[in-house]
């Protein structure tokens, strides 16, 4: 049979290089040969290029080279397949060499701030050697920060005249560092070069440049003193790499702006005794270049009551997030803090705080908790200057299965009853949320049974038991991963009762 | 700047071959072709074939098919031709030439300074 | 082989003449000509390729024409420093050849 009719021929001027062109050479059942026919020097020379690799792969491509390549030209194409049965050729496609043409990338060789101009970088890169002379090249630059994934990117053209290979990239955050790689193409060429090596540069440094400030109300003191611990971070979206030399913070009670205490600080909380009004907390954060914003937070008083407005809280898993959702009944509700820390029996040193607004829920990566510990979870509802009431949940960003089981006991042995009872497991050893309890009991050579209550109860009477017999018993205790079982316990019913 | 440096000048007895070298600088040795070209004492210029040293593709004047060699050595950026069976009318200064435009093949932008082979018995 | 004959092989000017060197292809080339200056015991030195396009940093001067087989050279006003030998050459395909020369002499 004839061989099939070469099809989809694209064509690829990599500068100065060569031309290839391939195309999809379809089922072929025995050898066939190419020949690619080409016109050029815009119709006045032409020559063909036969391919000669023995592997079906690689015959469907063939190149020309130098000096046979001109540009700007226009060349015609024509790929003929040929086998032992005849001949068949491709449709005729066209090509301006402008179009298809790919060069090296350029390189990039320096990346610098400007000085006193904030928040840009200067990129300066030398344009690829091999570039045709006679055609304007256009760039794609791309960026990120060195800790992020994601590209942003900017389009520009450079005159081929134009000796200042330079590119001003502004709108950046101050005192960060940037990633860089720019490729270029033949401004009337689809093809773009490859990405150039990438090269770091910093944008500078500037004042601080905001904070954010939440608060832990303890319970009153015997001197009707309270303790509010005071807690600050840098202001989301602030640059990872911001230096601050210090923290200013004053405060007040609200009724008399004439009582300001003021404080100086290099840590990232305070401890402050308010009394029982309602006071305001202001604080800066500053270095060398100069200060912060002012962020404020408002004490309430300690009689003072919080609104309240979460009527539900839930907390699920999923794709390796914690997602916390909640119901409100308060519609001009719309900035919430949220509050986590590990549940351990001591006092939690490990307070983390983050507001969320225009939104009902809250996710935070699985990796940045521990897993098979208990989290306790607040959110707190904010309204303009006041915090309401806060809900609270206890979740697992992933659970386990429980490292010990139910320390169980048995009680009550009658000749046909007996009373099953068992502790929690201690909060250290449950690794997620008990969801259920399951009673496994067997008589001595006889078929086992089980029973499954859920995990509020810790004690179970077993009935319908035979008399004067032994069983073995053991307690299960379960999370949403599994199960461990307790040690098991034997025991023997009685041959009678006292009220038989 | 774009530079073509070639060896010094020779003196071959008849029947010998010489290689003159030429080493590039200034651009990318890959991306241009390189042409060698002949003038006798006193004469006009004689083509004698090219390389390209990408892929080391070559073409040769007819006339010198048989006796001539062009090679490039990608790693020194330098172009070699070597001429065998040399007969006094082989006398003359050799040329390497670069082309230069990419809507102009076969012309030649930048020469090297020349090298004088002299065959004499 | 395509063959260049090149007129005349010399010629006597004097500054600020103009100038005109002729050559003839022996087959249609189109305007696959380049022209190439040559002083003694220097290198050639590319003048005009694709029979009217300048080279980089070459004067106004200097142009270049026609297409086919017959191709002109012209220096519109001949300066002291243009006192050389001109050469015509094809570059249609290889083998490449060039004209015998044009000799321009001081008057």
């Known amino acids: 049979a004839l061989p099939a009719k070469p099809e989809n021929i694209s064509c690829v001027y990599y500068y100065r290089k060569n031309l290839t062109c391939t195309w999809s050479p379809g089922k072929e059942t025995s050898y066939t040969q190419y020949t690619v026919k080409r016109t050029y020097a815009f119709g006045e020379k032409h020559d063909n290029c036969t391919t000669n690799s023995s592997t079906s792969e690689n015959r469907a491509s063939c190149s020309f080279f130098l000096p046979r390549i001109t540009i700007p030209d226009n060349y015609t194409i024509e790929v003929e397949a040929e086998n032992g049965d005849g001949v068949i050729k491709s449709h005729m496609t066209y090509w301006r060499l402008e179009n298809i043409a790919k060069t090296e990338p350029p390189k990039i060789f320096r990346v610098k701030p400007v000085l006193g101009i904030k928040r840009m970088i200067q990129i300066e890169w030398i344009k690829p050697e091999l570039a045709p002379v006679s055609s304007d090249l256009k760039y794609t630059l791309r960026f990120r920060t060195v800790n992020s994934t994601s590209w942003m990117e900017v389009n520009f053209a450079k005159n081929r005249k134009d000796k200042n290979q330079t590119y001003n990239l502004t709108g950046l955050q101050p005192f960060t560092e940037y990633v860089i790689a720019l490729r270029c193409a033949v401004k009337e060429s689809k093809f773009w070069s490859d990405w150039s090596q990438e090269k770091m540069g910093m944008t500078e440094e500037e004042a601080p440049c905001g904070l954010e400030l939440w608060r832990v109300l303890k319970p009153a003191e015997a001197d009707g003193r309270r303790p509010v611990r005071l807690l600050w971070k840098k202001a989301r979206g602030a640059p990872v790499l911001e230096k601050t030399l210090g923290y200013n913070i004053w405060y007040y009670p609200e009724s008399n702006t004439n009582l300001t205490e003021t404080m100086n600080t290099t840590n990232q909380q305070l401890e402050l005794h308010l009394g029982g009004e309602s006071f305001w907390v202001s604080m800066i954060s500053y270095n060398s270049l100069g200060k912060s914003p002012v962020a404020t937070l408002r004490i309430p008083a300690i009689q003072e009551k919080s609104f309240q407005c979460i009527e539900v809280m839930q907390a699920c898993v999923a794709e390796d997030q914690l997602v916390v959702k909640w119901q409100s009944s308060a519609l001009d509700v719309n900035t919430w803090m949220i509050e986590w820390f590990p549940d351990v029996d001591s006092e939690p040193t490990t307070l983390s705080w983050e507001s969320v607004s225009q939104a009902t829920n809250w996710t935070i990566q699985q990796d940045k908790l521990k897993p098979f510990w208990c989290y306790n979870i607040s959110v707190y509802p904010m309204l303009h200057d006041k915090v309401g009431e806060p809900y609270s949940i206890q979740a697992y960003a992933k659970e386990g299965v429980p490292s010990e089981g139910p320390e169980t006991k048995v009680e009550n042995i009658g000749v046909k009853t007996v009373t099953i009872t068992w502790k929690e497991i201690p909060k250290s050893e449950r690794k997620g949320i008990i969801c259920n309890y399951t009673i496994f009991y067997q008589a001595e050579g006889g078929k086992g049974f089980s029973k499954t209550v859920n995990s509020s109860i810790l004690q179970y009477g077993l009935e319908s038991l035979k008399r004067k017999t032994s069983y073995i018993v053991q307690v299960m205790a379960s999370t949403s991963a599994g199960g461990t079982n307790g040690t098991s316990i034997n025991f023997k019913t009685l041959s009678f009762s006292v009220f038989e | 700047q774009v530079q073509l440096v070639q060896s010094g000048a020779e003196v071959k007895k008849p029947g010998a071959s010489v290689k003159v070298s030429c080493k590039a600088s200034?651009?990318?040795?890959?991306?241009?072709?390189l042409n060698w070209v002949r003038q006798a004492p006193g004469q006009g210029l004689e083509w004698m074939g090219l390389?390209?040293?990408?892929?080391?593709?070559?073409d040769y004047n007819p006339q010198f098919q048989d006796r001539v060699t062009i090679t490039a050595d990608e790693s020194t950026s330098t172009a070699y031709m070597e001429l065998s069976s040399l007969r006094s009318e082989d006398t003359a200064v050799y040329y390497c030439a670069r082309d230069g435009y990419d809507d102009g093949p076969y012309t030649l932008e930048t020469w090297g300074q020349g090298t004088l082979v002299t065959v004499s018995s | 082989d395509i063959q260049m004959t090149q007129s005349p092989s010399s010629l006597s000017a004097s500054v600020g003449d103009r100038v005109t060197i002729t050559c003839q292809a022996s087959e249609d080339i189109y305007s696959f000509v380049a022209w190439y200056q040559q002083k003694p015991g220097k290198a050639p030195k590319l003048l005009i390729y694709n029979a009217q396009t300048e080279a980089q940093g070459v004067p106004s001067r200097f142009s270049g024409s026609g297409s086919g087989t017959d191709f002109t050279l012209t220096i519109s006003s001949l300066q002291p420093e243009d006192f050389a030998t001109y050469y015509c050459q094809h570059h249609y395909d290889s083998p490449l050849t060039f004209g015998g020369g044009t000799k321009v002499e001081i008057k």
């Open positions: 390389i390209n040293p990408y892929n080391g593709g070559t």
């Open positions: 200034g651009y990318t040795f890959t991306g241009y072709v």
